[in-house]
């Protein structure tokens, strides 16, 4: 079951990764210099998705900056099946399914002068389910709470802040949010929940809930990298890989993250019986990423450089501001209860070999079905 | 219910000073971009200029800026219009007005005038 | 300065008939066109700003349209309290937003 994840794995933008940049880790890298020290978390599915939108408003060099940042190489497929395969991605995770909330999407909110090209507004309708607003920018916070209102109905109150601040000379504003909760394949139990500590440095230390679960997981340790990873599957296709960097080893552990280090990964968990201890918490990320995209060579589109004319045939629009916004809420439930303390003794034998893995200071975190939905690190749950 | 109420006009000689003040009610005015418009008798509008809600951002009708001096007080929900070396083209209607958008006042004062003679 | 011009000073309509006002910009505004309504001895009303919106409580047969240099202000039923002077102002670039001269309406 995990093997075959790792073939469906989608690790770039879409089903065209090309080797030359890995969007997915060198954002990681670009958003973790930015503020070393604090929690990260971002979903590199729904980034990819709103930027491959923006391309198809797009010419020249602005569209060409975007599809190389996002490490696409349309000589291996055209324009028409990467927006077709984001249009098949977004049509399977915004499906109903039983025990898995998942909200994703785009909207664009635009001046009320700007005029949107039909053809762009209906490409975004039909292939990226996307909206468009206009709105009054000269009101700040009239169009502030305009756009965190339109995201809060979305997401069901699960994001209800968005926007902390809004330039009053925005023009177009871009807004890419995902919200994910699901129930575990099997439910920690949460009378096993107990306050413990968390090892934010050496010298910070803080109480957190930490959940436990004794169970056969998919687990390795990797020399390489000095660290362990865990599996825990969700129901349905889902499934979080924990990453706990031996101490000291977070750095090392980052600058390892590739593509090929997560399929390796994948292709090598082998089931083994684990005392897993894991923070219950709920991890946010939101981002402004007209400040971080330049740094892979996607610039263009923010400045007086960007070529959008498919979006409007005004001469001077630019995106004022690219702001994504990801949730995801860790906790006990699962689809099945687990297993009852008066149970765990019949494994009396394999629990003489489990491993204890205390999830007590920093660690990354993936959540992937056959793409990356998310990526983080907690520093602080 | 929304309200702006000018004072301080009247008759002032050429080359002398005068300032306006306007009081808003009924809306959170901080928040609000503020503008001055004057109407010469039985003439059309003119902008005058407009300050933004944190008076970081204060632009003037360029014919203007040397003389018009455009400030506010949020705390007692007030903008002001100070004009000095006034000439008798100034004679006018002055409102003062909230703009709802780029330069579009959606609320606007009664008016207060200014007579300018000898 | 951006120079907003109403050819014609007077425009004279019977209740129920539809009238358009045109308005010239001296350059292309895009959209940013708005239109006052001020009544005698009243101060200017905001109806429509943007070319075509339509602001809060004004009521539809008030409507505008046009884009770049040339725009239009439409009453499609007018009633006798629409006597009134309109203007037109481009709010694309500032300082100063400025205004078209107006337009007299009156009732016959």
């Known amino acids: 079951e995990m093997k075959k994840r790792v073939e469906d794995l989608h690790v770039g933008a879409t089903v065209a990764p090309s080797s030359r940049r890995d969007f997915t880790f060198d954002l990681y890298r670009a958003l973790a210099s930015a503020a070393p020290s604090q929690s990260i978390f971002f979903s590199p599915v729904s980034i990819s998705m709103s930027l491959a939108m923006l391309s198809l408003g797009a010419g020249s060099s602005t569209k060409m900056q975007i599809l190389e940042g996002l490490g696409l190489n349309l000589q291996k497929s055209s324009e028409k099946e990467l927006h077709r395969g984001f249009q098949q991605l977004l049509q399977e995770l915004n499906q109903p399914r039983d025990g898995f909330q998942l909200s994703l999407g785009n909207a664009l909110f635009t001046d009320l002068v700007v005029d949107l090209q039909d053809t762009f507004v209906s490409a975004m309708k039909t292939l990226y389910l996307a909206d468009t607003f206009p709105t009054n920018f000269r009101d700040s916070a009239g169009a502030m709470k305009q756009i965190n209102d339109y995201v809060a109905k979305q997401t069901k109150g699960k994001i209800v802040d968005l926007l902390k601040n809004l330039d009053s000379n925005a023009v177009v504003i871009m807004v890419n949010y995902i919200f994910f909760k699901a129930k575990w394949e099997t439910s920690f139990n949460h009378k096993g929940t107990q306050e413990q500590d968390f090892y934010v440095t050496s010298e910070t230390v803080v109480r957190v809930p930490m959940m436990s679960r004794e169970d056969q997981y998919h687990y390795l340790l990797d020399r390489n990298l000095s660290c362990r990873v865990v599996g825990v599957p969700y129901q349905g296709n889902a499934t979080a890989l924990f990453i706990l960097p031996s101490e000291g080893k977070m750095q090392q552990v980052e600058n390892g993250l590739s593509e090929k280090t997560l399929r390796k990964w994948l292709k090598m968990f082998k089931k083994r019986q684990l005392e897993l201890y894991l923070p219950k918490f709920s991890i946010e990320g939101s981002y402004q990423l007209e400040k971080v995209l330049p740094s892979l060579g996607i610039s263009n589109v923010f400045t007086s450089h960007a070529d959008l004319s498919g979006i409007s045939n005004h001469s001077n629009i630019q995106v004022s501001e690219m702001v994504h916004k990801a949730v995801v809420e860790v906790d006990e439930s699962g689809t099945r209860a687990a297993a009852a303390t008066g149970t765990i003794f019949t494994f009396r034998s394999a629990r003489l070999n489990s491993q204890r893995l205390v999830f007590n200071r920093p660690f990354l975190m993936f959540i992937v079905d056959n793409n990356i939905l998310f990526l983080g690190k907690v520093n602080r749950p | 219910e929304v309200k702006l109420l000018e004072s301080g006009g009247g008759l002032v000689q050429p080359g002398g000073s005068l300032k306006f003040s306007c009081e808003a009610s009924?809306?959170?005015?901080?928040?609000?971009?503020m503008s001055w418009v004057r109407q010469a008798p039985g003439k059309g509008l003119e902008w005058i200029g407009e300050?933004?809600?944190?008076?970081?951002?204060?632009t003037y009708t360029s014919s203007l800026k040397d003389r018009f001096i455009i400030s506010r007080d949020n705390a007692k929900n007030t903008v002001y219009l100070q004009m000095s070396k006034v000439r008798s083209e100034d004679t006018a209607l002055y409102y003062c007005?909230?703009?709802?958008?780029?330069?579009?006042?959606?609320?606007w004062g009664q008016g207060t005038t200014l007579t300018v003679s000898s | 300065d951006i120079v907003m011009t109403q050819s014609h000073k007077f425009m004279s309509t019977s209740v129920g008939d539809r009238v358009s006002i045109t308005c010239k910009a001296s350059?292309?505004?895009?959209?940013?066109v708005a239109w006052y309504q001020q009544k005698p001895g009243q101060s200017p009303k905001l109806l429509i700003y943007?070319?075509?919106y339509r602001y809060t409580g004004v009521p539809d047969r008030f409507s505008g349209s046009g884009s770049g240099t040339d725009f239009t202000f439409t009453i499609s039923s007018v009633q006798a309290e629409d006597l009134a002077v309109y203007y037109c102002?481009?709010?694309?670039?500032?300082?100063?937003?400025?205004f078209g001269g107006g337009t007299k309406l009156e009732i016959k």
């Open positions: 007005a909230r703009l709802f958008y780029y330069g579009t006042p959606d609320y």
């Open positions: 350059q292309d505004v895009i959209k940013a």
């Open positions: 102002q481009q709010h694309y670039s500032s300082p100063p937003w400025t």
């Open positions: 300050i933004n809600p944190d008076s970081s951002t204060i």
């Open positions: 009924g809306f959170d005015f901080s928040r609000y971009w």
């Open positions: 943007s070319t075509s």
